[in-house]
């Protein structure tokens, strides 16, 4: 009769056994054992006993201990198993953001491990327990899924392997994946709104707004705002589940035309996005051209108003004949235009918005001196000893200067409060001059005196 | 003992599809994964794709996406790998190899190889 | 994907006398588990490469103990500590860390 010993050994993968084997008749013929395994007798007394040492065991075997007695032939076998971790354990990759509402799939795959009878994979949220099934296949895959909550919002999932070799006087084995951290989002259906001018005038600063409720995590949520090819660099506030992104924008002549601005909020794996057309325009003020600004009385001016190509103007309230960028008038100087506001008003059509320009100059006319009876009255009578302002107003452009003399050297004290004397009374020059000539006027001071009453 | 036998050599033309065969005996089928290796003369052994036995999965090596169809018959205990589009440069021996889905552990047991020629 | 450097391309070795090839790799085969997924293999003329070490530095199963294998990283050496008739043939090592999983060019060894 042949004995093994152990009849049954777990041993790690790699790991080197002891095997006893064992007759019952003293004297056997053949004691020995089978196996493809490496093995190496080690020497004892005795004819009826042989130990053997079983290396580098890589899997299962059933190494088989024989002898052949006067009574016959006998064998019997030893149950070699071999137990080795897992080598991987994984859970198949996924987006780290997931939708609130979606279901997302966990996929765990392990790669090896012994016997697959103690193996057991078990799918976790945190250390709450999603899944456990036994480790079948390879890879063994196990599922399970889960429907994507806000408050999973920063969960992390695992898997992890339990190899229990405890009834077999072992340990528990644990290996456990990297963890996938899951990232939960809510990006509305709803587009972000965009407030922004429809039109912008070249070398001016707009200012443009998007915004958008309902949004989860909010602080996550990227901003994207652009005009053409130029990125905004906006201010972003941010509400509980909102944020509003403020930008300036400024154009050049080189972005004229009709420009896109877009406005993009990424979230998780996720984008809404608002277009919106701004055009941009180059609209200088009109022109407003005099023949010379500062002309003499009489001279003929012609005034011009000239605007942008597609603008319609008026010059003084008067459109242009035919209507268009271009209008002018003639006249010929009084000195009633010295002064005169000529006011040009342009009207360009931009993207159905009508904007006014105006541009305004003003003439200047060269004319005089004048004294005329009006203004500078010939003759004075006043009473002795009275108190009277002489007037006298030259007019002109420049203004004269104006001097009234007596013999030549007693002057009249024009404009000054005088008490009335004898030697007032007599007959002045008036003399207005300017850079535009001179003129005279006589002017006569009678004094009455009391006597005479 | 454990043993994988392929189908036998194969000649085709430029492009030809091929399917060969790899039997396995010897362990549970289901419970090692199934690699393709193949070996273009003067060239280094260059690996295709891997099986699971268990549940039909596959990946393949991204140089043979789409001209590779890896399939299972486990009734059969066989697994199979079929190459569409054949050109000259896939001239090679074609080896079925056992392991673990990953190879971690290495290609332990390996067929006889296949010889395939691609010749017009 | 990862290239792996053997050296020599050949050896030839004096029977009983020992041999070591190596294998450097073009980027780390330490994998995120900590494991290193770097394996060797023995193609004997007209025959299939036979597994002899798996990661690193295991013996597979009926690989005589004069086979070691050795390093970390990206440099690898095979050892045979006495070379024997029957070890002729080419030497590949191979990596299963990173995907596409790649071999080395090989290496001959031939008796002197």
């Known amino acids: 009769q042949t004995s093994v010993s152990p009849s049954k050994v777990i041993l790690p993968r790699g790991g080197s056994v002891l095997v006893t084997c064992s007759t019952s008749c003293d004297q056997p013929k053949l004691l020995g054992i089978e196996t493809p395994l490496p093995k190496k007798e080690l020497l004892l007394p005795g004819n009826n006993r042989k130990v053997y040492e079983l290396s580098n065991v890589q899997e299962d075997s059933q190494p088989m201990c024989y002898s052949n007695c006067p009574d016959g032939q006998s064998t019997a076998k030893t149950f070699l198993t071999v137990y080795w971790t897992p080598e991987r354990v994984e859970l198949a990759p996924l987006p780290s953001w997931q939708p609130v509402g979606k279901n997302l799939t966990l996929r765990c795959q392990v790669e090896g491990g012994a016997p697959r009878a103690n193996l057991t994979v078990v799918l976790l949220r945190g250390e709450k327990e999603l899944k456990r099934e036994p480790a079948v296949g390879e890879p063994a895959e196990v599922t399970t899924t889960v429907l994507v909550r806000r408050d999973h919002h920063g969960a992390n999932f695992s898997c992890r392997t339990e190899l229990d070799l405890r009834p077999q006087g072992l340990e528990l084995f644990e290996n456990t994946s990297a963890p996938y951290q899951l990232q939960t989002f809510v990006l509305p259906a709803t587009p972000p709104q965009l407030v922004s001018p429809r039109v912008l005038e070249v070398d001016t600063q707009g200012t443009v707004v998007c915004s958008l409720d309902g949004l989860f995590p909010v602080s996550e949520a990227q901003v994207h705002l652009a005009l053409g090819d130029q990125r905004l660099n906006p201010t972003v506030t941010y509400g509980n589940d909102s944020f509003s992104a403020k930008a300036s924008v400024s154009v050049t002549a080189e972005d004229e035309g009709t420009q896109r601005l877009t406005c993009a909020v990424i979230l998780g794996n996720q984008s809404q996005e608002t277009l919106q057309t701004v055009t941009i325009y180059s609209f200088p003020a009109p022109n407003v051209i005099l023949t010379k600004p500062e002309v003499s009385e009489g001279t003929e001016v012609t005034v011009k108003c000239e605007a942008h190509p597609r603008a319609k103007v008026t010059l003084n309230g008067v459109p242009a004949q035919p209507l268009g960028p271009r209008a002018q008038l003639l006249l010929k100087a009084t000195p009633e235009d010295n002064g005169r506001s000529f006011s040009c008003s342009a009207t360009l059509e931009v993207a159905g918005q009508l904007i006014h320009k105006n541009q305004t100059r003003e003439l200047r006319v060269l004319y005089g001196p004048r004294l005329d009876e009006r203004d500078c009255p010939g003759n004075w009578t006043w009473p002795e000893n009275s108190q009277q302002t002489p007037m006298c107003q030259a007019w002109g452009n420049p203004l004269p200067e104006l001097k009234c003399l007596k013999d030549g050297t007693f002057p009249l004290p024009i404009g000054e409060s005088v008490t009335v004397t004898r030697d007032l009374e007599g007959t002045y020059l008036c003399r207005a001059r300017s850079t535009q000539g001179e003129v005279t006027r006589k002017v006569t001071v009678n004094v009455l005196s009391p006597r005479y009453e | 003992q454990v043993q994988l036998v392929q189908s036998g050599a194969e000649v085709k033309k430029p492009g030809a599809s091929v399917k060969v065969s790899c039997k396995a005996s010897g362990y549970t089928f289901t419970d090692y994964a199934l690699h393709w290796v193949r070996q273009a003369p003067g060239q280094r052994l260059e690996w295709i794709g891997v099986i699971s036995t268990y549940s039909g999965n596959t990946d393949y090596n991204q140089k043979f996406r789409g001209r590779v169809t890896m399939t299972r018959d486990t009734s059969a205990t066989t697994a199979y790998l079929e190459l569409s589009s054949l050109r000259s440069e896939d001239t090679a021996v074609y080896y079925c190899?056992?392991?673990?889905?990953?190879?971690?552990?290495?290609?332990?047991?390996w067929g006889q190889g296949t010889a395939l020629t691609v010749s017009s | 994907d990862v290239v792996l450097t053997q050296t020599p391309l050949s050896s030839p070795v004096t029977l009983g006398q020992p041999a070591s090839i190596s294998c450097r790799s073009s980027q780390t085969l330490v994998y995120r588990n900590g494991n290193t997924y770097l394996h060797w293999y023995l193609q004997r003329a007209g025959q299939p490469p036979r597994l002899l070490i798996y990661?690193?530095?295991n013996r597979f199963s009926g690989v005589p103990d004069r086979f070691s294998g050795s390093g970390a990283g990206t440099d690898f050496t095979l050892k045979i500590s006495r070379v024997e008739a029957e070890d002729v043939g080419v030497y590949f090592c191979?990596?299963?860390?990173?995907?596409?999983?790649?071999f080395g060019g090989g290496t001959k060894l031939e008796i002197k």
């Open positions: 190899a056992r392991s673990l889905y990953f190879g971690s552990s290495g290609f332990d047991y």
């Open positions: 191979s990596q299963n860390t990173h995907f596409p999983y790649t």
């Open positions: 990661k690193v530095s």
